[in-house]
């Protein structure tokens, strides 16, 4: 029976040319972790496997760094960055848990615009 | 279900090469991560080297680092170690592990195959 529950980062906003971190926690379970993948749409960004170790995909090896913990950041955002990411937990013996994350990534002036405006 | 069998053990002199095989049945593993770990008498298991997206990423211990090759051959399903320049210290038995993939969630784990480096 699958007890467990994702909390992620949610719907999160960055700069073009910035970082950003996405994270995933895993609670309510003591299920163990065997491996985190890491998706945007149907690509595989990233893989952390509990006893084979971090491997980023070729294609994001220059703008993708593992960590901090199970999370991931990207680097160098640029607006094509803008969509859905996902923490895919294989547990066990659990099952495989999913977390979903919006990235929108914001041309610097909008950014900057939209920080302005905030309401305290 | 999914079989990880290794080969290419043996024993050979300090100094010598071996090249061990690991060959995936059952599931493919070119978007996973596969790799080696090895057991020496009276200790615990541990991590050698990993490889992924069929060689781009590689993933290696400091004790094997210079000495050590992980490759894969996606086409044949099958996961290489080239073990050079051999120690008496890397007598172990060596595993092939491959990361899970859905629905199983759990790394799996060939039966090993026996290397001795005699000096």
């Known amino acids: 029976m699958m007890t467990g529950t994702i909390e992620t980062t949610g719907n999160i906003s960055a700069e073009k040319g910035g970082s950003i971190i996405l994270q995933c926690h895993l609670s309510s379970t003591t299920a163990q972790v065997t491996q985190v993948n890491w998706e945007q749409q149907d690509q595989l960004l990233a893989i952390c496997n509990a006893d084979l170790g971090w491997h980023i995909s070729p294609s994001f090896k220059d703008r993708v760094a593992p960590g901090p913990g199970l999370g991931l950041t990207l680097q160098s955002l640029t607006v094509n960055d803008t969509g859905e990411y996902f923490c895919i937990y294989h547990t066990y013996p659990d099952g495989t848990y999913t977390g979903r994350i919006f990235l929108e990534v914001l041309e610097s002036s909008v950014a900057e615009h939209g920080a302005r405006f905030q309401i305290p | 279900e999914v079989q990880l069998v290794e080969s290419g053990g043996g024993l050979v002199q300090a100094g010598g090469s071996l090249r061990l095989s690991c060959a995936a049945s059952g599931r493919t593993f070119s978007n996973n991560v596969m790799g080696w770990f090895r057991q020496a008498p009276g200790k615990e298991r541990e991590f050698v080297a990993a490889?992924?997206?069929?060689?781009?990423?590689?993933n290696y211990a400091d004790s094997v680092k210079g000495r050590f090759t992980i490759s894969a051959d996606n086409a044949k399903n099958t996961v290489y170690l080239q073990m050079n320049s051999l120690k008496p210290e890397d007598t172990a038995v060596y595993y092939c592990a491959a990361g899970p993939k859905t629905p199983d969630t759990r790394n799996y784990w060939g039966q090993g195959t026996q290397v001795t480096v005699s000096s």
């Open positions: 490889i992924s997206w069929g060689g781009a990423s590689t």
